[in-house]
Interface confidence: medium
């Protein structure tokens, strides 16, 4: 008479997360007397998945009946996989013991694996804005995938990057993983229409990489460029001067005109352009009253972007001169030209 | 023919630690359940637990908390320890093979038993 | 744990006679699964018959099991003068494995 043997055919299940699986287990004999008991591992820790004596298991069914009486069948489903689930499960047959059933007979155990999906790449820039030729990280974040091989891929509008650094966590065995990613792109003025994508390509999405963007709109600041130029007359004692902002973003500005040094008026940017790049332009003009000034006047055209140090630009209007004889004077001295901008 | 041959301290003090080795001549390890057996002066027979050659052990639950029974596969031996030892643990103590496919077994071979007496 | 009272404590025969020895469990055995065995003075117990009646290596055929669920029986048919001892019946049907406390047989 040959003993008990504890059968399991699978040595290793692959199914996908949310799907049922399937642990087979046949015994080779009706005896001992005793239940099968299922188990994730070995050794003390183990976790008890089914008992065919007792207990309550909701997740588990089993494939053939147990209470009939020349059953050899203990296979078993799992539904609901998710990746914690994985691990090695063992058939034991226990035989009859007092106070508790004594472990008899276990199976060389089914590995299982969980392939799960990973989940929707996030990628995050700077916290704060940058200004064009400046080097910026993005970083790009994806978890609860299964198995740990992974492909990640960094494009910014459709071109591949190659400055990136990836991590998948953990390094060991694990039921699920995460990967980590950060990717440094140089930004260009052209930039405010830009894309960075962040792809991530696993066995579970079945050539239909997944993926995440960020726009550079929310990652750059392109600094205005100041011009002040001086219009041909519109009355008698007065000159039309223009303070042209172009090429900036965001459009957060404020412009204030200073008249020899005092503060002549200020205004937001409302009504702009939008260039074809994304960034913006805007005018200002100031009527200056020639009659009421004695000696020459220095205009300044002050303008705070986004929250930046202010940058200005200044155009000297000679009262001596008769107003209808100056024309559009673009080369005007700026005694203030030298634009400030503070990364 | 199989033989057992067991060895081991045969007088103890009260809390001492018994010991005793069972050697398996003249047939196969593996495949057998091997078993301590204990028998008190004038009494019957008490089984006190097995061992597989795989290591897996089951010990009467009314000395678990102070039995370890061991197994050595390349000397074809196994041991028995019972801590915290007593008067009460002064018995004739016998090694045997345990035969059978139930997943429990009757005994078809027996050491020649070593009388282990705990005294003050 | 299943308990094994075996009857009566002490047998009084004579060789020749037949003697029938109780065993009984307080709850249900698989009838494959008692044994019997003898144990003599200063001596191992003996394996006599385990199973379906089967009986051990050199055991003569006088020595024969009978019974089931909570009772047994061993009978030895013709008593000689070497089988009187101490008999034990053993179950191996549930964990812990128990005995009984034995019957002597004696020469009366």
């Known amino acids: 008479e040959e003993e008990l043997q504890v059968i399991q055919p699978d040595k290793s299940v692959l199914v996908a997360a949310g799907e049922t699986a399937t642990l087979r287990c046949t015994a080779t004999s009706l005896i001992p007397v005793g239940p099968i008991q299922w188990f994730r591992g070995a050794g003390p820790g183990r976790e008890l998945i089914y008992n065919q004596k007792e207990g309550h298991f909701p997740r588990v069914t089993t494939v053939s009946d147990l209470t009939k009486r020349n059953n050899m069948d203990f296979s078993i489903r799992i539904g609901n996989i998710t990746p914690a689930d994985a691990g090695t499960y063992y058939c034991v047959k226990f035989r009859k013991g007092s106070p508790d059933d004594v472990e008899f007979k276990s199976g060389a155990g089914t590995e299982l694996s969980v392939r799960a999906k990973p989940s929707a790449p996030v990628v995050s820039g700077p916290a704060a804005r940058a200004t064009p030729q400046h080097t910026v990280s993005f970083t790009c974040e994806s978890h609860g995938f299964s198995p740990r091989d992974i492909t990640l891929k960094w494009f910014k509008n459709g071109n591949e990057l190659s400055d990136f650094q990836t991590n998948v966590d953990p390094v060991g065995e694990s039921v699920s993983y995460s990967i980590h990613s950060t990717a440094k792109v140089v930004l260009t003025r052209e930039d405010v229409h830009s894309q960075v994508i962040c792809e991530v390509a696993h066995v579970t999405l079945q050539g239909d990489p997944l993926r995440g963007t960020a726009n550079l709109s929310e990652t750059i600041r392109v600094p205005p460029t100041l011009e002040v130029t001086q219009q041909p007359v519109r009355a008698e004692n007065q000159v039309n001067v223009t303070c042209q902002v172009r090429k900036f973003y965001p459009q957060r500005l404020q412009l204030t005109w200073l008249e020899n040094g005092n503060v002549s008026r200020t205004e937001t940017a409302s009504t702009v352009t939008e260039n074809k790049d994304g960034t913006y332009n805007w005018m200002s003009w100031l009527l200056v009253n020639v009659s009421a000034h004695r000696d020459d006047v220095k205009l300044t055209c002050q303008v705070e972007h986004d929250g930046q140090p202010a940058v200005s630009k200044s155009h000297d209007l000679k009262v001596s001169a008769h107003p209808k004889e100056q024309g559009s004077n673009t080369a005007a001295e700026n005694t203030g030209s030298n634009e400030r901008n503070i990364y | 023919q199989v033989q057992l041959q067991q060895w081991g301290a045969g007088l103890l003090k009260p809390s001492e630690t018994l010991s005793l080795t069972c050697a398996v001549y003249?047939?196969?390890?593996?495949?057998?359940?091997w078993s301590w057996i204990r028998q008190p002066p004038g009494k019957g027979l008490d089984w006190i637990g097995e061992?597989?050659?795989?290591?897996?052990?089951n010990y009467n639950p009314s000395l678990k908390r102070r039995v370890t029974i061991s197994i050595d596969t390349s000397k074809n031996q196994f041991s028995l320890k019972l801590t915290s030892v007593t008067a009460a643990d002064t018995a004739v103590y016998y090694c045997?093979?345990?035969?059978?496919?139930?997943?429990?077994?009757?005994?078809?071979?027996w050491g020649q038993g070593t009388l282990v007496t705990v005294s003050s | 744990e299943i308990v094994l009272t075996q009857s009566p404590g002490t047998l009084s025969l004579s060789p020749g006679e037949r003697a029938t020895l109780s065993c009984r469990a307080s709850?249900?055995?698989?009838?494959?699964?008692l044994a019997w065995y003898q144990q003599k003075p200063g001596q191992a117990p003996r394996l006599l018959i385990y199973?379906?009646?089967s009986r051990a290596t050199g055991i003569p055929d006088r020595f024969s099991r009978s019974g089931s669920g909570t009772d047994f029986t061993l009978t030895i048919s013709r008593l000689e003068p070497e089988d009187f001892a101490v008999y034990y019946c053993?179950?191996?049907?549930?964990?812990?494995?128990?005995f009984g406390g034995g019957t002597k047989v004696e020469i009366k």
């Open positions: 053993q179950q191996y049907d549930s964990s812990p494995l128990t």
């Open positions: 199973g379906a009646s």
């Open positions: 061992i597989n050659h795989s290591g897996s052990t």
């Open positions: 045997a093979r345990g035969r059978g496919y139930s997943g429990y077994y009757y005994f078809d071979y």
């Open positions: 709850q249900s055995v698989s009838s494959s699964y």
């Open positions: 003249g047939g196969s390890f593996s495949g057998y359940y």
